[in-house]
């Protein structure tokens, strides 16, 4: 769950409360069991621009 | 304010040895992949060794042309990351950054050390 | 491993032009959901700076001048209005699998 008081992360980002900052959720492919990662699995990811 | 600071480096003889430190500060250091890239003209950028995390017993990984020669190693008390180089040959040759990544892209560099191996 | 090829080796763009460096890896880097591939610029004497991660997501700092784009194997990055301050060697890097390798770099140098 994201820390009280701070901005949302942006769109393809989790919060994590171990590293205390919004994470990418595309990091998530090598390191699955991360803080954050369970916030990115409800959350779209960032489209590609193509 | 994110910081790697290198020690180590030299001049060195082809079968010789040689031990390259980093110290970091600034960020959770036992949370991230700590990881040695060298930089030659005939090689250009080279990963070279990466060791991971103490929760999976700090796996390493290295690159085919340093297996068997270079160890990397972490103290995780001490915010610090290891390349020990043995069996040194003159292709080894470059500048050598520590970086850190955690877990696709290197974030941070540190200001690089420059190795020559040459008799 | 996979390998990354970077076009041109040299680039020489006037001030405020469009400067466009190519970026080619010898297998798909992508998800459906991300490309697995950065941007880093080097100045002399420095290490690499990183600019853009996961193909399109500028670091923050990084001015919006700086754009990525791609997916699959092919991958741009383009600097418009190039500055004076963009001098330097550019390189991508992929994060596929192990070894990360980065291509042979793109000099920019300001006609």
């Known amino acids: 769950e994201q820390a009280p008081g701070t901005a949302p992360c942006s769109r393809g980002s989790s919060w994590s409360a171990d590293l205390d900052k919004c994470m990418d959720c595309a990091s998530c492919r090598a390191r699955p069991a991360s803080d954050f990662c369970l916030g990115c699995a409800a959350a779209p990811p960032a489209p590609f621009r193509l | 304010e994110v910081k790697l600071q290198q020690s180590g480096g030299g001049l060195v003889q082809p079968g010789g040895s040689m031990k390259l430190s980093c110290v970091a500060s600034?960020?959770?250091?036992?949370?991230?992949?700590m990881n040695w890239v060298r930089q030659s003209p005939e090689q250009g950028l080279e990963w070279i060794a990466e060791?991971?995390?103490?929760?999976?017993?700090?796996?390493?990984h290295y690159a085919e042309s340093v297996k068997g020669r270079f160890t990397i190693s972490r103290d995780d008390s001490k915010n610090s990351v290891y390349l020990q180089m043995n069996n040194l040959r003159p292709e080894d040759t470059g500048i050598y950054y520590c970086?850190?990544?955690?877990?696709?892209?290197?974030?941070?560099w540190g200001q690089g050390t420059t190795l020559t191996v040459s008799s | 491993d996979t390998v990354l090829t970077q076009s041109p080796a040299s680039l020489v763009v006037s001030l405020g032009q469009r400067a466009t460096i190519s970026c080619r890896a010898s297998q798909s880097v992508s998800t459906s959901d991300y490309s697995y591939i950065h941007w880093y610029q080097q100045k002399p004497g420095q290490p690499p700076k990183f600019l853009i991660k996961y193909a399109s997501n500028r670091d923050s700092g990084v001015p919006a001048r700086f754009s990525g784009s791609g997916s699959g194997t092919d991958f741009t990055l383009n600097i418009h209005p190039v500055e004076e301050d963009d001098t330097a060697i550019y390189y991508c890097q992929h994060s596929w699998e192990i070894p990360p390798t980065f291509g042979a770099g793109t000099k920019l140098e300001l006609q």
């Open positions: 600034g960020f959770t250091f036992s949370y991230y992949w």
């Open positions: 060791i991971r995390l103490q929760s999976n017993d700090y796996p390493t």
């Open positions: 970086a850190c990544r955690y877990a696709d892209y290197f974030d941070h």
